[in-house]
């Protein structure tokens, strides 16, 4: 039985600078004036962040079609980035003995690159997605998912690992990014914010969504995760944004209804198998794709990220349950568990659909096979 704990006035931070928050953050002291306890003391030696527009600059966006009930990312308005203050790089702390499983956390010391050097790599995740700059790649075919509809038995393990809520998946969930690009799902987990503060990891034109689901996959070319880590395409993650909608999402409720049982850090429970594909958007044909990294230590690169264009709708109550039920390290609420967006450093995000209108047409020139030309270059 868990002892009651006092709710934090200022929950453990992760990735959000305050500039990126929609409402109610004006009273927070600026980092320069009075750094919050969880903020890093200095990040001069770390890679900088992309300049992001403040969320309050974005008008409210309505779903495109009533039948679908889901926002499409290309519906978001294009906003010029005004050069906001950089978001802090999230940090982690590692056991002094240097255990093979590092003990890290969001918003603490030392910086993640000290936990895992790969976290200072040039091609990290998450990133800000700017549809206008995405390269339309007709070769990106609809994703194929097989075996994602699981029977109730055997049950699946749902765990509060102190960083997220994670559902371990059985073998047999097959996913193809395209011909010869086959993967099997390992686990899924979520990232979220706090009351009135969004917590997705990826952003779109600087807009941060309430939450984000990640389904982590291992390439069938590798038998073990440790062999695949850091290898191009060794791991692939399907990511979808979670948004507030008018109705309860019955698929998510199968997990969210069990969170109270795993409120304590490290606790776990068994849940009946469910349709994992129902946790994802229905449109597998429209997505963004780029090569990045794991968003937590070990931050291994070579990860193929596929971010759905369509979002998933959860009720306000469900989003509140997600962000307000679990506890993390040090008797702090498990909230704002997202990493700051990382610089693209020359990477081009590809889109499986024409995500942006090219306002500056270019002369036709030879293009290498299997390559896509970034719009607006």
């Amino acid at each position: 039985q868990r002892l009651p704990r006092m709710q934090e006035d200022s929950p453990l931070g992760g990735g959000s600078s305050g500039e990126d928050d929609p409402l109610g953050e004006e009273d927070l002291p600026s980092e320069e004036d009075s750094p919050r306890e969880e903020d890093p003391p200095g990040e001069e030696d770390l890679p900088g962040e992309e300049d992001l527009p403040g969320e309050e600059d974005l008008p409210e966006v309505k779903p495109k079609s009533e039948e679908e009930g889901s926002l499409k990312l290309e519906d978001l308005p294009t906003v010029e980035a005004p050069g906001d203050p950089q978001e802090p790089q999230n940090n982690a702390h590692r056991d002094k003995e240097g255990d093979d499983q590092s003990h890290w956390r969001y918003g603490g010391d030392p910086p993640w690159p000290r936990v895992s050097p790969a976290c200072a790599g040039r091609f990290q995740s998450p990133v800000d997605i700017r549809p206008q700059l995405a390269a339309f790649c007709p070769a990106l075919r609809p994703l194929e998912l097989l075996g994602f509809q699981l029977p109730p038995l055997p049950e699946l393990r749902l765990r509060n690992n102190g960083h997220s809520v994670q559902l371990t998946l059985p073998p047999g969930l097959e996913m193809a990014l395209g011909p010869g690009r086959e993967y099997r799902a390992l686990q899924l987990h979520l990232h979220w914010g706090a009351a009135g503060r969004p917590g997705s990891e990826h952003t779109v034109e600087g807009h941060r969504f309430p939450a984000e689901i990640h389904v982590v996959h291992l390439s069938t070319a590798f038998a073990r995760v440790d062999e695949a880590l850091g290898r191009p395409g060794g791991l692939a993650v399907l990511a979808a944004f979670l948004e507030e909608g008018p109705e309860e999402n019955s698929a998510y409720e199968q997990l969210l209804s069990r969170l109270e049982e795993i409120a304590e850090e490290g606790s776990e429970t068994q849940v009946p198998g469910l349709d994992i594909s129902a946790l994802l958007p229905s449109d597998f044909s429209r997505y963004f794709q780029y090569e990045g990294s794991l968003t937590t230590p070990p931050c291994a690169q070579g990860v193929i990220w596929t971010v759905f264009n369509q979002t998933v709708m959860l009720s306000a109550k469900q989003l509140h349950t997600l962000s307000d039920t679990l506890w993390g390290p040090g008797d702090s609420r498990l909230q704002l568990n997202f990493r700051a967006t990382q610089p693209l450093n020359g990477r081009v995000i590809e889109a499986s659909f024409p995500a942006g209108v090219d306002s500056s047409p270019r002369a036709a020139e030879p293009v290498q096979l299997n390559s896509c030309l970034a719009a607006g270059d």
Epitope: D95, H103, L153, P154, L186, V225
Partner: antibody, heavy 122, light 107 residues
Framework: QVQLQESGPGLVKPSETLSLTCTVS????????WSWIRQPPGKGLEWIGY???????NYNPSLKSRVTISVDTSKNQFSLKLSSVTAADTAVYYC????????????????WGQGTLVTVSS | DIQMTQSPSSVSASVGDRVTITCRAS??????LTWYQQKPGKAPKLLIY???SLQSGVPSRFSGSGSGTDFTLTISSLQPEDFATYYC?????????FGQGTRLEIK
Amino acid sequence: QVQLQESGPGLVKPSETLSLTCTVSGGSISSYYWSWIRQPPGKGLEWIGYIYYSGSTNYNPSLKSRVTISVDTSKNQFSLKLSSVTAADTAVYYCARRGYDILTGYDYFDYWGQGTLVTVSS
Amino acid sequence: DIQMTQSPSSVSASVGDRVTITCRASQGISIWLTWYQQKPGKAPKLLIYAASSLQSGVPSRFSGSGSGTDFTLTISSLQPEDFATYYCQQANSFPITFGQGTRLEIK
């Protein structure tokens, strides 16, 4: 190299409480699950329960009413208390680390103590 | 609770032999099965986890397979140090349970 060492009395009287401590060296107790497992002489292994470094516990229902596992992160130790013991609790008691791969969710007992024999007898 | 049943209870073999030990779960456990080796007076040693993943440092002559309810541990060519008792353990649901053990003896 992580090492685990059980300590405690080798003889406990019936109806009393068995108390054992496991000291972890060569690594931090943080970020892992720490278990107690026992093995009656000449028999198989029985999982007693685990504790996460933060204090979260999970016990075998067959022993739950009698078991308490606690952790002291400052000393890098975790402990087992088993109340109202009988001769059936005579066993070699092992402490073990339940490793957990955060990427895959796989878990396993990867480090074990050498075990300590506890005899319940008057 | 999930019952784990190993067979055979004991097996005699010679150095160089190929030996297979089976483990059956009373209900499906996906691939959440672990194999351990225990020598007299010693603690168990992790061999295989997630049904088929070889623990670091364990010789490649050990292999595991299976999914659902039926699993096997195979030693491709027995070495003198392999004579021991082998246990399977399910990690799918709580309580964690072990098989009764298979004793591998020298013929």
